[in-house]
Amino acid sequence: EAHKSEIAHRYNDLGEQHFKGLVLIAFSQYLQKCSYDEHAKLVQEVTDFAKTCVADESAANCDKSLHTLFGDKLCAIPNLRENYGELADCCTKQEPERNECFLQHKDDNPSLPPFERPEAEAMCTSFKENPTTFMGHYLHEVARRHPYFYAPELLYYAEQYNEILTQCCAEADKESCLTPKLDGVKEKALVSSVRQRMKCSSMQKFGERAFKAWAVARLSQTFPNADFAEITKLATDLTKVNKECCHGDLLECADDRAELAKYMCENQATISSKLQTCCDKPLLKKAHCLSEVEHDTMPADLPAIAADFVEDQEVCKNYAEAKDVFLGTFLYEYSRRHPDYSVSLLLRLAKKYEATLEKCCAEANPPACYGTVLAEFQPLVEEPKNLVKTNCDLYEKLGEYGFQNAILVRYTQKAPQVSTPTLVEAARNLGRVGTKCCTLPEDQRLPCVEDYLSAILNRVCLLHEKTPVSEHVTKCCSGSLVERRPCFSALTVDETYVPKEFKAETFTFHSDICTLPEKEKQIKKQTALAELVKHKPKATAEQLKTVMDDFAQFLDTCCKAADKDTCFSTEGPNLVTRCKDALA
């Protein structure tokens, strides 16, 4: 229903703590360069204003839309043009164009230093001094680096962070308590970020219909006992929630997500038998838990899919009467029978089915034409299954670091024009799929692998869009979202690429590498590997292995040497010469 004051309505629904957190996230995602203190001041002003509207909904400006209120706040920031350049032009526009303009200026790769975790003692001291400010800093730092992070989920991660600090800061050995727990939260949050960015890309590029199809497939896999209308209702609501968050309407998004969680918990009987444990939790944990709840047990008596979608004499009539509903029921029926498939694969199958009906229902004898459609699915199913088998076998053989290197070589050959930092980031992320998915039971591997890879490749596409350099990447990123991963997998060595000339300084290292954390050392080595491939795109795996082994040996020797600097300056040039010879 309509409310006199939108801001008062949201403040009342969400409560002060969540309201302030969400406003902080919204401002941090829009103006990514501002400091925490600048944003905290704005948040306090907005909150104070919201309270006046709660007290009197008829007070001045309380009837304004949230976009108007927030946009006016952002546009009042001093030195906006100096700090943000053309983003300041957004402030000359009226709503809704102004908000659209802010959205277009969100930067997926802001030039901010990596978010460094303070040392345990220091962290506990500042947390104990002011937990609210400490958590505010966390929300600000994550939100500005991830401008599409799912806001209510970020509140959940902040809550996790808070609980870990509360527990570990009371322990004697704070460091060993904090590190593994915070690493776990960080890993989960980073995966959540790329997954949500993929959803927003789907919404932005292909509209609500595409996202809703994704949601129908995903929900049908998770809730195979819910009927089609129930799944469609959940998908419709989920689409609204995600549209709001992707569009910067974070208060509405969080409020609607809470409503959806409430609905699911009140209607467990028609949705799933697995929801109770989630529903017993408080709000943020409940919504998070529902989003990753285990699949319900599939009904035992499901008839073969062919009955309604191939053998039925009225397939074309049913399709003509309501195309979206008929295709939706197909996607629902196929997905509930296949929790072992990725959503991307299910959407490719639905697309194939739709194309078949479009063609066949216009012919003289439709049943003869679409009668083989399920058999035509086979190659589409085999391709990702083979991908999973090949890659998991390789991961088991090489381990995570070696697997990342294999992917780095592969992707540098596919798109050598892409910047080395982007290739290294992509390969490291793609390589994590092994650790994340290959250890799972067989029937969970494919959905885990393909849907994760799709999300990572979406980030590759977003970064490439800013500075397009590779025709290969442009080709794969221009097509439909579900075809991207197969497109990237099918790419081979880019024959148009002119190899980079060999620069000794690219492969010159200094003793400071010895004191770097293991992760940073790996990145240095992987940077060198990508540069080697750019110099020799057709180098064999054996040649590259020889060089990398030599390089590892060189680092090991010099980092153990008494006089490291001398070792690096004398042995380094020898290494470069050996590398050139090995690749000649």
């Epitope: 009927d227 089609f228 209308a229 129930e230 469609t232 209702k233 419709t236 609905y263 309604d308 029921t329």
Partner: nanobody
Framework: EVQLLESGGGLVQPGGSLRLSCAAS????????MGWVRQAPGKGLEWVSL????????YYADSVKGRFTISRDNSKNTLYLQMNSLRAEDTAVYYC??????????WGQGTLVTVSS
């Protein structure tokens, strides 16, 4: 037994509006997804819209999006279809129908909507 009774049809000029109603009885209305289906003269059936028991609209045909609004009042066991910006091609018999799991299982008798100047 299940009964669905449509009303509100009639003759209207292009650009005009009509509101159809469907009174339901003989079943627990708020447990069922409901819908409107139409059949233009000499044409096949076309599904117009579907609404979940909770009131969430789960389907509109592309041909009516932005012009028609489906709604329901569970306390009155009534389904509605608000039709705005009517066109000649909206001329049809409009049926209220109950959805059960995979398809419509009960239909009303229909109400005729004629859009003509």
């Amino acid at each position: 037994e299940v009964q669905l009774l449509e009303s509100g049809g009639g003759l209207v000029q292009p650009g005009g509006s009509l509101r159809l109603s469907c009174a339901a009885s003989g079943f627990t209305f708020n447990h069922y997804t409901m819908g409107w289906v139409r059949q233009a003269p000499g044409k096949g059936l076309e599904w117009v819209s579907l609404i979940h028991p909770s009131g969430t609209v789960i389907y509109y045909a592309d041909s009516v999006k932005g012009r028609f609004t489906i709604s329901r009042d569970n306390s009155k066991n009534t389904l509605y279809l608000q039709m705005n910006s009517l066109r000649a091609e909206d001329t049809a018999v409009y049926y209220c129908a109950r959805w059960s799991s995979r398809a419509f299982d009960y239909w009303g008798q229909g109400t005729l909507v004629t859009v003509s100047s």
